[in-house]
């Protein structure tokens, strides 16, 4: 070996100076009697080497690097040899920091693995190989006096946690625990923890289950869930408190917390939830009243709350078939009595024959809002209920009675906008209890089955705004019936449009007779169309060759018109405009020529 490098320290604080010397032995002088020693750090040549010849003939170069800013680099001592640089020796230099004090040391006792798991934060990067050791000892008191040392726990490379196995633990006694960090630049120690492993026990959560329904147990009430949990086996005898959290599966609701629950409750009825709603539930527990750590949340249990029987008022209305008065068509509408009135699965119409105690005969069971049935001859009344899996609504009696009450008067209707109609009336005396308002297409499209109806509960009302199923350009029949205590009044009806359409065509003009100065025209009126308001008038327009225009207004019953004062042998353009309150439309143009003065008149 021709050269040898010595350094003041191979590992230094990052940014600190470092001094190195390189000695070239005399027996290498065949390279060059006065060789020039060069220094290189990594790939860069470093100036500043001070070279001298020693008394024994060796050459020495000393260099001081003022700041070592590389965390790792090779320092080389070189000679120029021909055109290349010959490395005589090199050393690895490292720079970094002493270890910071490890912080946030915490431990958990795991009863499944029977070990104490401690973790910490190692602090900033040192850039140097740094070892961590979890150190501990047993102590009878509060760790002021050190008992038996426990075997050091050395984590795997790169890990910041370590497990102390059961054989080195003493439960229900304090242990002193700390982390020691060490590298070439120093040693640091975390603050010491003093703990009883059982005080940092982390339990596993119980397993949530739905309760098996037992025949003798009452089913859960609406909006309630019955659940139970299986305690975590290793924690069977540990006093714990638990908390439950739940949220609806649908929507963005956040978790709602219920607790504390004693672990040993083992079963629980959770109420105050939305009926017929799927919920996600989780449970977690903590050793209590002794110290401990909360378990993780249990795996989710998904359960659906039972529904509640429908809480609705059923507004009813009925109609008899004209040809068969015992065939009744019954209509109803559910009106919720509460914010959550329960799901409606269907409806049942039933009749209880007099003298047959307890016997109830169903007349129809449907999911629709109406049904048609044959009313037994002795039946004056039926009952209607809404039902679901939880039960039925309160029965609504429907009494079939003759209309004996007074009629309302002055029934009228007017358009509010193209999709609504106002129907008004003068209430009869005495006041009714309410009204039924029915509406549907008038003739020729009229149909009893396609009528919309509404119950107006206020007997003093003098009108009602129809907003459902109203379309423009359609004729509607509106029927209003007053309702009394045990009877009803006669129905009244009125026809109305919410918006009428302008005539779609004007009649075609035909020339009947023509002369030199006159022309007789005629037309066939368009038949009236539903949805189109009746014609109010016609206007006839004629224009001569000089583009002069003339017009005349005719009443709606006109079938023809004679144009007078025309010029002989002249060309005229004529058209007819048919007008209603909703607008007007023009006919096609008729072009004619009056006769020459010498010509004979045409009839």
């Amino acid at each position: 070996e021709c050269g040898h490098i010595s350094v003041s320290a191979p590992i230094v604080h990052l940014g600190d100076p470092i001094t190195a010397s390189c000695i070239i032995k005399q027996n290498c002088s065949h390279l060059d009697p006065e060789p020039q020693i060069l220094w290189r750090l990594g790939a860069e040549l470093q100036p500043g080497g001070r070279q001298q010849r020693l008394s024994d003939g060796t050459q020495e170069s000393i260099i001081t690097l003022p700041h070592l800013n590389h965390t790792q680099a090779f320092l080389s001592c070189c000679l120029n040899w021909g055109n290349s640089l010959q490395i005589l020796d090199q050393v690895e230099l490292r720079a970094g920091y002493p270890p910071a004090i490890p912080h946030n040391l915490s431990c958990l006792m795991n009863l499944t693995t029977s070990s104490l798991i401690c973790q910490w934060e190692p602090g900033p990067e040192t850039h140097l190989p740094t070892s961590f050791t979890l150190k501990s000892f047993k102590s009878r008191g509060n760790c002021q006096t050190q008992g038996d040392s426990i075997l050091d726990c050395v984590p795997k490379d790169g890990q910041s946690h370590c497990c102390i196995p059961r054989k080195h633990l003493l439960l229900y006694q304090n242990m002193g625990i700390w982390v020691q960090a060490e590298n070439a630049l120093g040693t640091s120690m975390s603050p010491q923890l003093c703990l009883d492993p059982m005080d940092v026990v982390k339990l596993e959560p119980p397993m949530l289950r739905t309760m098996d329904p037992s025949p003798e147990a009452a089913p859960p009430q609406a909006g309630c869930l019955q659940l139970c949990w299986e305690p975590w086996q290793p924690g069977l005898h540990i006093n714990q408190k638990c908390e439950l959290r739940h949220k609806p599966q649908r929507g963005e609701a956040s978790w709602a917390l219920v607790g504390p629950l004693p672990l040993e409750a083992l079963q629980y009825e959770l109420c105050g939830l939305l009926p017929a709603t799927a919920y996600t539930l989780q449970i977690r527990c903590i050793r209590w009243p002794l110290p401990g750590h909360w378990s993780d949340w249990s795996p989710s249990l998904e359960l659906r709350t039972t529904e509640r029987a429908p809480t609705v008022r059923l507004d009813t209305w009925w109609r008899q078939r004209q040809l068969d008065p015992r065939t009744v068509q019954l209509f109803w509408k559910p009106v919720p009595l509460e914010e959550d009135s329960g799901r409606i699965q269907g409806y049942v119409v039933s009749w209880r024959p007099s003298g047959q105690a307890g016997a109830i005969l169903p007349l129809c069971n449907t999911t629709e809002l109406s049904c048609t049935f044959h009313l037994p001859s002795e039946a004056q009344e039926v009952a209607l209920v809404a039902y679901n899996s939880a039960g039925t609504s309160r029965p609504t009696p429907v009494v079939f009675s003759e209309s004996r009450g007074p009629a309302l008067t002055r029934l009228h209707a007017m358009a509010r906008d193209p999709h609504s109609l106002w129907v008004g009336w003068e209430p009869p005396n005495p006041w009714p209890q309410g009204y039924v308002i029915e509406w549907g297409l008038g003739p020729p499209s009229a149909s009893n089955s396609n009528k919309t109806w509404r119950m107006e509960q206020n007997g003093r009302a003098t009108g009602f705004l129809l907003k459902e199923n109203i379309r423009p350009f359609q004729l509607y029949e509106i029927i209003v019936t007053p309702l009394y205590q045990d009877t009803m009044g006669p129905s009244q009806h009125v026809y109305a449009y919410s918006q009428e359409m302008a005539p779609s065509h004007a009649p075609e003009l035909h020339l009947k007779h023509i002369g030199k100065t006159w022309a007789q025209l005629e037309w066939v009126p368009e038949p009236p169309e539903l949805g189109k308001s009746p014609l109010t008038h016609y206007t006839i327009f004629w224009t001569n060759a000089q583009n002069q225009s003339f017009s005349a207004i005719l009443n709606a019953s006109s079938r023809g018109f004679v144009l007078h004062g025309l010029e002989p042998a002249s060309l005229y353009h004529i058209h007819l405009m048919a007008a209603s309150q909703a607008g007007a439309t023009n006919s096609t143009v008729l072009t004619l020529m009056t006769l020459t003065p010498e010509g004979s008149e045409l009839h």
């Epitope: 009863l111 499944t112 029977s114 059961r166 086996q233 005898h237 040993e264 409750a265 083992l266």
Partner: antibody, heavy 118, light 107 residues
Framework: EVQLLESGGGLVQPGGSLRLSCAAS????????MGWVRQAPGKGLEWVSS????????PYADSVKGRFTISRDNSKNTLYLQMNSLRAEDTAVYYC???????????WGQGTLVTVSS | DIQMTQSPSSLSASVGDRVTITCRAS??????LNWYQQKPGKAPKLLIY???NLQNGVPSRFSGSGSGTDFTLTISSLQPEDFATYYC?????????FGGGTKVEIK
């Protein structure tokens, strides 16, 4: 110092009943599971029943299920064992014991002898 | 139910001997195994809990080991006061069960 004192043992005819009591002192009774262990003459230890700190969980050995009832009164620091339909094979010394969190019997009473014989 | 099998059921040993008693569970019980010592006419006394933890006041010549199904109680140097019957007990389930016992007698 933990002390457990059993009472209520004695001679009873087959089919008869007895109620054992265990008075506890020297620790917070309401925080601990408690249990009964018996030992027939010349035989080993047999677990009979245990009860959770607030009395909600009460497991029993198959040999006594349906006949024995364990209970506790935390206000009186007392554990009970109601024994009905007694049989000759129930003859034993009955020990009351305090359980630790890991299910070990940390402290025992001195025992009370129950003899079932006609 | 979990069965606990203790062996031997009895053994003779001299003062100063190393004595080992084993206990086997019919299914895994983690570390939930406790050892008791009982002398004639006396209540049992807890020696070791959670397989290897020495109860306060118990001499360090007693030690426990094992996990899962196989457990051992070791007395490193038998003393005259150690002649007694030893029981293991599992506390993994609510229905705790004891082993049949091992009687340690003077040789």
């Amino acid at each position: 110092e933990v002390q457990l004192l059993e009472s209520g043992g004695g001679l009873v005819q087959p089919g008869g009943s007895l109620r054992l009591s265990c008075a506890a002192s020297g620790f917070t009774f309401s925080l601990y599971w408690m249990g009964w262990v018996r030992q027939a003459p010349g035989k080993g230890l047999e677990w009979v029943s245990s009860i959770s700190s607030s009395g909600g969980v009460t497991p029993y050995a198959d040999s006594v299920k349906g006949r024995f009832t364990i209970s506790r009164d935390n206000s009186k620091n007392t554990l009970y064992l109601q024994m009905n339909s007694l049989r000759a094979e129930d003859t034993a010394v009955y020990y009351c014991a305090k359980l630790g969190e890991l299910g070990m019997y940390m402290n025992w009473g001195q025992g009370t002898l129950v003899t079932v014989s006609s | 139910d979990i069965q606990m099998t203790q062996s031997p059921s009895s053994l003779s040993a001299s003062v100063g001997d190393r004595v080992t008693i084993t206990c086997r569970a019919s299914q895994g019980i983690s570390s939930y195994l406790n050892w008791y010592q009982q002398k004639p006419g006396k209540a049992p006394k807890l020696l070791i809990y959670y397989a290897s933890n020495l109860q306060n006041g118990v001499p360090s010549r007693f030690s426990g080991s094992g996990s899962g199904t196989d457990f051992t109680l070791t007395i490193s140097s038998l003393q005259p006061e150690d002649f007694a019957t030893y029981y293991c007990q599992q506390s993994w389930t609510y229905g705790q069960t004891f082993g049949g016992g091992t009687k340690v007698e003077i040789k």
